[in-house]
């Protein structure tokens, strides 16, 4: 988890100002209105190899 202004969240996650921590972009399927989901739209998901080993 990152503080604002430091290194970005890990791949597949995005910073939530509301929750003050990095959140998994995968959760945007269930909660698309979450503040961090805007950041997820611009970021790629986790590497392909992690999902299809």
């Amino acid at each position: 988890e990152q503080a604002p202004g430091t290194a970005p969240c890990s791949r597949g996650s995005s910073w939530s100002a509301d929750l003050d921590k990095c959140m998994d972009c995968a959760s945007c399927r269930a909660r698309p209105k979450s503040d961090f989901c805007l950041g997820c739209a611009a970021a790629p998901p986790a590497p392909f190899r992690l999902l299809w080993p």
Partner: antibody, heavy 119, light 111 residues
């Protein structure tokens, strides 16, 4: 430090009622979906009920096995979750866990409270 | 409802062994980007603890010897080098739809 503390379990006769409570602390309760998950003695985990947020009009969902008998509710002002259990059956005997999660995976779990339905 | 089939139901292993547990869903629980499968560890008399979410994302504080993989219907939890504190029961769970369902559990015992 996240903490979920269940209470209200005990021995109840078949057909009886019980109300479980879960007191939450250490996270933004009002932003998290909450569920009850149960575990019968020596058995696996079974999801029971879920309640979402105020912005979702506190939408609720239930397992078929408890629909019409159990009611899940929450009080965000008290950081508390509840499970009203009516028409209890022997097969409802289990440890009941309160769980919290933003979505999908259940991040936070209480220690559980035992409900025994027996005559 | 989506059925979750875990195998084996129990296994005996020694400290240092590599352990693999599998979970099969009765239908796909993945999108093109993410898999809605999670793994928990439960020790006797204790509440379950989340280990891995979205098939492969290790929870904060969980040792790196735990890893998860898979997509679609077939998923795997691997413990690369079993430690004494890893003897427990492990459950998979999907969050693709309501009702959420868990696998039957895999009990990892000391050989």
């Amino acid at each position: 430090q996240v903490e979920l503390v269940e209470s209200g379990g005990g021995l109840v006769q078949p057909g009886g009622s019980l109300r479980l409570s879960c007191a939450a602390s250490g996270f933004t309760f009002s932003s998290y979906w909450m569920s009850w998950v149960r575990q019968a003695p020596g058995k696996g985990l079974e999801w029971v009920a879920e309640i979402r947020l105020k912005s979702d009009n506190y939408a609720t969902h239930y397992a078929e096995s408890v629909k019409g008998r159990f009611t899940i509710s929450r009080d965000d002002s008290k950081n508390s979750l509840y499970l009203q259990m009516n028409s209890l059956r022997a097969e409802d005997t289990a440890v009941y866990y309160c769980t919290g999660y933003y979505a999908d995976a259940m991040d936070y779990w209480g220690q559980g409270t035992l409900v025994t339905v027996s005559s | 409802d989506i059925q979750m089939t875990q195998s084996p139901s129990s296994l005996s292993a020694s400290v240092g062994d590599r352990v693999t547990i599998t979970c099969r869903a009765s239908q796909s629980v993945s999108t093109s980007s993410y898999s809605y499968m999670h793994w928990y560890q439960q020790k006797p008399g204790k509440a379950p603890k989340l280990l891995i979410k979205y098939a492969s994302n290790l929870e904060s504080g969980v040792p790196s010897r735990f890893s998860g993989s898979g997509s679609g219907t077939d998923f795997t939890l691997t413990i690369s080098s079993l430690q004494p504190e890893d003897f427990a029961t492990y459950y998979c769970q999907h969050s693709w739809e309501i009702p959420y369902t868990f696998g039957g559990g895999t009990k990892v015992e000391i050989k």
